[in-house]
């Protein structure tokens, strides 16, 4: 009678065991064990037992004692389960953005593990159980379905294996997957508004606003403004499910013409965009030209104005004849046009856009000096003692320099408050002299005496 | 530190009897089988007897065969090796050395330093 | 009765490899395990289970079994490694059972 110790064995894969052979005769002619596993005859004085270790055991065996007695022959097995966790363990590679709203199906494969009739496979978010099943085929495939919500944000889906064999005295052997971490999301269908200027000039600034509501997670979308080629840098504002990126944009006479605008909003794996044309423009102001700024009375004058080629001008009101970029008008100089502004205004169309630019030049006429009666009456009386002040106006550009004396030594205090008396009275040179020449006037002031009764 | 003590050796003529003893220390004595391994001058070294942890089990080299005797104290941490009928063949050192903890794989860890026992007349 | 034999003698060049052979009736069913011993010393063990090393061995001894023979090899053979070296098994009648012995001279 041959038997075996231990008649049932589980052990780790590539493990060792010793198993026992034993006999019931004293002396047997043979006793052994029979497996393809290496195995090793261990020490065990006497000849009706032996010891094997048998090693490296990579899958389910059995060894088979014998033993040759003379009563005859007879075997017995043992049974090496080998135990192994899963290989792999691996959620099958999902988007990490999902859209809430979206049904997201979770595959777990697991690859190896054994016993299988021991061997779990549970889906988990957090540590919640979606799904448990037992492990079958290979590899083994557990999936299930999850309606993504937006309070699935940030949640770590895994998949873990259970190998039990508490039942057999071992322990429970858990493999868990790398997580799955899910990042949700809500993109409006609606494109972002964009709000900018449909024209911008050449060497100035403007401001592009772009905005959008009802997203989720607000401070995970990115905001993509651009001007042609040009990135644009924009301060984004967060709302709770809203944004605003404002950007200045800077144009130059290279970025002339039509020029797209875009503003793109991306989230998880999905975007919005918004597309403007903006007509960049160049328009200086209108160019007023005189023959000369600063003219003596009675020079004829030319008056002058050019503009962009595409621009409508008025000069001075008066629209260009024939309609155009120029207009001109001749003019002889005289005193009132001392201080005169011709003002050019151009009008160009840029993207169905009326633009207007202004430039104004002023005349100086030189004339004079000039001595009126209105402004310096050639006679006063004035009572003695009484207060008074003598007025003389000299007319000319330029303002002409005013000196009345009276025998070229006596000066009538022009422009100053002065009390009557005899010594006033006589004539008075007036002299007017500036660059343009001088003018003489000749005032007499007469003094009243009181009349006493 | 582990260790193995032996005494007892000495001069003693043929036919005649001698007590080796072999001290433990420094591990738990009554976990292991411990041997006692012969070496004659200039010669190898040969197998004399094996005891079991508890006692309770005894081996011996067939050139020993009933005149040895192997025997353990526990209590004391003490191997014995009782000669009788010495043989000048007998002459050689002496030592006890420890079977590792599994003892089914047979091989020696640890080994005294020797005790020399001298048979002639 | 399984009987182990070793060659008396080996000598190796310092740096070279040592082998040294030990044969017996399939050897390899069984474990060899070897020893070291320097004149006037006890026996250490240097390599259990075919080709295990105790800790404090040096990584130069190595061993292996196979078929009828166990070998213990010894690379970069230093000068303290000149000693005599034991191979050792069991067998069921007698239970221990010794080599011979070889004695391995490192030259120079």
């Known amino acids: 009678q041959t038997s075996v110790s231990p008649s049932k064995v589980i052990l780790p894969r590539g493990g060792s065991v010793l198993v026992t052979c034993s006999t019931s005769c004293d002396q047997p002619k043979l006793l052994g064990i029979e497996t393809p596993l290496p195995k090793k005859e261990l020490l065990l004085p006497g000849n009706n037992r032996k010891v094997y270790e048998l090693s490296n055991v990579q899958e389910d065996s059995q060894p088979m004692c014998y033993s040759n007695c003379p009563d005859g022959q007879s075997t017995a097995k043992t049974f090496l389960t080998v135990y192994w966790t899963p290989e792999r363990v691996e959620l099958a590679p999902l988007p990490s953005w999902q859209p809430v709203g979206k049904n997201l199906t979770l595959r777990c494969q697991v690859e190896g593990g054994a016993p299988r009739a021991n061997l779990t496979v549970v889906l988990l978010r957090g540590e919640k159980e979606l799904k448990r099943e037992p492990a079958v085929g290979e590899p083994a495939e557990v999936t299930t379905t999850v309606l993504v919500r937006r309070d699935h944000h940030g949640a770590n889906f895994s998949c873990r294996t259970e190998l039990d064999l508490r039942p057999q005295g071992l322990e429970l052997f858990e493999n868990t997957s790398a997580p799955y971490q899910l990042q949700t999301f809500v993109l409006p269908a609606t494109p972002p508004q964009l709000v900018s200027p449909r024209v911008l000039e050449v060497d100035t600034q403007g401001t592009v606003v772009c905005s959008l509501d009802g997203l989720f997670p607000v401070s995970e979308a990115q905001v993509h403004l651009a001007l042609g080629d040009q990135r644009l840098n924009p301060t984004v504002t967060y709302g709770n499910d809203s944004f605003s990126a404002k950007a200045s944009v800077s144009v130059t006479a290279e970025d002339e013409g039509t020029q797209r605008l875009t503003c793109a909003v991306i989230l998880g794996n999905q975007s919005q965009e918004t597309l403007q044309t903006v007509t960049i423009y160049s328009f200086p102001a209108p160019n007023v030209i005189l023959t000369k700024p600063e003219v003596s009375e009675g020079t004829e004058v030319t008056v002058k104005c050019e503009a962009h080629p595409r621009a409508k001008v008025t000069l001075n009101g008066v629209p260009a004849q024939p309609l155009g970029p120029r207009a001109q008008l001749l003019l002889k100089a005289t005193p009132e046009d001392n201080g005169r502004s011709f003002s050019c205004s151009a009008t160009l169309e840029v993207a169905g856009q009326l633009i207007h630019k202004n430039q104004t030049r002023e005349l100086r006429v030189l004339y004079g000096p000039r001595l009126d009666e209105r402004d310096c009456p050639g006679n006063w009386t004035w009572p003695e003692n009484s207060q008074q002040t003598p007025m003389c106006q000299a007319w000319g550009n330029p303002l002409p320099e005013l000196k009345c004396l009276k025998d070229g030594t006596f000066p009538l205090p022009i422009g100053e408050s002065v009390t009557v008396t005899r010594d006033l009275e006589g004539t008075y040179l007036c002299r007017a002299r500036s660059t343009q020449g001088e003018v003489t006037r000749e005032v007499t002031v007469n003094v009243l005496s009181p009349r006493y009764e | 530190q582990v260790q193995l003590v032996e005494s007892g050796g000495g001069l003693v003529q043929p036919g005649g009897s001698l007590r080796l003893s072999c001290a433990a220390s420094?591990?738990?004595?009554?976990?292991?089988?411990i041997n006692w391994v012969r070496q004659a001058p200039g010669k190898g070294l040969e197998w004399v007897s094996t005891?079991?942890?508890?006692?309770?089990?005894?081996f011996y080299a067939d050139s020993v065969k009933g005149r040895f005797t192997i025997s353990r104290d526990n209590s004391k941490n003490t191997l014995y090796l009782q000669m009788n009928s010495l043989r000048a063949e007998d002459t050689a050192v002496y030592y006890c050395?420890?079977?590792?903890?599994?003892?089914?794989?047979?091989?020696?860890?640890?080994w005294g330093q020797g005790t020399l026992v001298t048979v002639s007349s | 009765d399984i009987e182990l034999t070793q060659p008396p003698s080996v000598s190796v060049a310092p740096g070279q490899t040592a082998r040294i052979s030990c044969s017996g009736d399939s050897l390899g069913s069984k474990y060899v395990h070897w020893y070291q011993q320097k004149p006037g010393q006890a026996p250490v063990l240097v390599i259990y289970s075919d080709k295990k090393r105790p800790s404090g061995i040096p990584e130069r001894f190595s061993g292996s079994n196979s078929g009828n023979t166990a070998t213990l090899t010894i690379s970069g053979t230093q000068a303290e490694d000149e000693a005599d070296y034991y191979c050792q098994s069991y067998d069921s009648n007698p239970m221990l059972v010794f080599g011979g012995g070889t004695k391995l001279t490192v030259l120079g």
């Open positions: 050395a420890r079977t590792t903890l599994n003892y089914y794989y047979g091989y020696m860890d640890v």
């Open positions: 420094g591990f738990t004595f009554n976990s292991y089988y």
């Open positions: 005891i079991s942890s508890d006692g309770s089990n005894t």
